[in-house]
C-alpha cells in the first residue's frame, strides 16, 4: 500500500539548552519558542522541495 | 541537554534516508548561528507504514 508520502523519524540533542518541566507543557513560552525555531529550521534545511512538514515533536531530557 | 524527537514527511520518492540525515548534518553550523542551537547525535530512520499512516504531517 503506497500513501505517496515517506515518513522519517529524526532524533537529535541540543547540547546548549537545559531541559526543564516547561518542555513537557505545550502551552509554555519555552516549549512554543523552541518548537517554532525547530519548525522554521526544518523548512530552511529541506526547502528544495518534496518536504511536506513535521509532526509529533517531543522534548525529553538528554 | 534537550533531546528532540519528531517525524518528517516528504513526497514519496523525493528523498532517501541518507540525504535526510546528510542535509540536516550539513545545516548544524547554521543552526548554531541562526537559532543558537548546538545540535549533536543526529539519528534518522524510516517510519514503518502502520505508524506513519496514523500521523499526519503538519
Amino acid at each position: 500500500l503506497s500513501t505517496g508520502v515517506s515518513f522519517f523519524f529524526l532524533s537529535f540533542h541540543i547540547s546548549n539548552l537545559q531541559f526543564n518541566s516547561s518542555l513537557e507543557d505545550p502551552s509554555t513560552d519555552y516549549y512554543q519558542e523552541l518548537q517554532r525555531d525547530i519548525s522554521e529550521m526544518f523548512l530552511q534545511i529541506y526547502k528544495q522541495g518534496g518536504f511536506l512538514g513535521l509532526s509529533n515533536i517531543k522534548f525529553r531530557p538528554g | 541537554s534537550v533531546v528532540v524527537q519528531l517525524t518528517l514527511a516528504f513526497r514519496e520518492g523525493t528523498i532517501n534516508v541518507h540525504d535526510v540525515e546528510t542535509q540536516f548534518n550539513q545545516y548544524k553550523t547554521e543552526a548554531a548561528s541562526r537559532y543558537n542551537l548546538t545540535i549533536s547525535d543526529v539519528s534518522v530512520s524510516d517510519v514503518p507504514f502502520p505508524f506513519s499512516a496514523q500521523s499526519g504531517a503538519g
Epitope: S6, Q48, G49, G50 | E12, G13, T14, I15, N16, V17, H18, T22, Q26, D46
Partner: antibody, heavy 120, light 107 residues
C-alpha cells in the same frame, strides 16, 4: 553533451599510491554529486563513495575510508580519487559516475573507467 | 548495510523469450532501486530508476517492478543486443550497494 573523461590506465607497485581523474564537461560541475565505483576483474560493482563538488562534502563506504580520498577541483571541473597503500586486491577498473540532480537517485552518466593494475 | 541479492547469477535464453531477473534487498529500500546494463568492456548504462521508471532511450521491452524488498527487471522479448550483465543497486541508504550481477546470454 555531458561527458566524463577519466585518466588513462596505471600500473603501480604494492605500497604505492595512484590518483585517478575524472574530467566533467557539458554541465555545471558543482551542482551534481560525483560517485566512484570499483570493479575488480570479472567481478561486480562496488560503491566507494561520493563528493559533492559544490560543498566538498564527501561520504565514504566504510570499507574504503582508509583506502581512498575523494577531491574535486571546481576550476578544472575535475574530480579525483587517490588510492593509497596499493595491494594486488586493488587491481580493478575504477569508474566515476554522476548522480542525477535533485531527487534523482541514480547514476545517469559514467566515465569510461580507469584500469589500475597493482603488480610487483 | 543493505545487502542486495540478485538471481539468477547467470541465465541463457532464446531470442524472443521473456526474461525476468530478480533482486532482493535485506531491508525495505522504498523503491530506491536502480537497474544498470553492462556490456563486455563497457561502462554500465542506466536502464531503470525508482524501481520502475525507464530512462530515456531505453527500449520499451524493458520494465521494472517491485516494492519493499523485492524487485525485478523484465525483458518482454529478448533481443541479441540485450546480451550483457545486469546489476541492481540500492539507493536508499549508504553504502549504495549493488547486486552481484546477472549475466544474460543467448541460447
Amino acid at each position: 553533451q555531458v561527458q566524463l573523461v577519466q585518466s588513462g590506465a596505471e600500473v603501480k607497485k604494492p605500497g604505492a599510491s595512484v590518483k585517478v581523474s575524472c574530467k566533467a564537461s557539458g554541465y555545471t560541475f558543482t551542482t551534481y554529486t560525483m560517485h566512484w565505483i570499483k570493479q575488480a576483474p570479472g567481478q561486480g560493482l562496488e560503491w566507494i563513495g561520493y563528493i559533492n563538488p559544490g560543498s566538498d562534502y564527501t561520504h565514504y563506504n566504510q570499507k574504503f575510508k582508509d583506502k581512498a580520498t575523494l577531491t574535486a577541483d571546481k576550476s578544472a571541473s575535475t574530480a579525483y580519487m587517490e588510492l593509497y597503500s596499493l595491494r594486488s586486491e586493488d587491481t580493478a577498473v575504477y569508474y566515476c559516475a554522476r548522480q542525477g540532480n535533485y531527487a534523482a537517485y541514480y547514476f545517469d552518466y559514467w566515465g569510461q573507467g580507469t584500469l589500475v593494475t597493482v603488480s610487483s | 548495510d543493505i545487502q542486495m541479492t540478485q538471481s539468477p547469477s547467470s541465465l541463457s535464453a532464446s531470442v524472443g523469450d521473456r526474461v525476468t531477473i530478480t533482486c532482493r534487498a535485506s531491508g525495505n529500500i522504498h523503491n530506491f532501486l536502480v537497474w544498470y546494463q553492462q556490456k563486455p568492456g563497457k561502462s554500465p548504462k542506466l536502464l531503470v530508476y525508482n524501481a520502475k521508471t525507464l530512462t530515456d532511450g531505453v527500449p520499451s521491452r524493458f520494465s521494472g517492478s517491485g516494492s519493499g524488498t523485492q524487485y525485478s527487471l523484465t525483458i518482454s522479448s529478448l533481443q541479441p543486443e540485450d546480451v550483457a550483465t545486469y546489476y541492481c543497486q540500492n539507493f536508499w541508504n549508504v553504502p549504495f550497494t549493488f547486486g552481484q550481477g546477472t549475466k544474460l546470454e543467448i541460447k
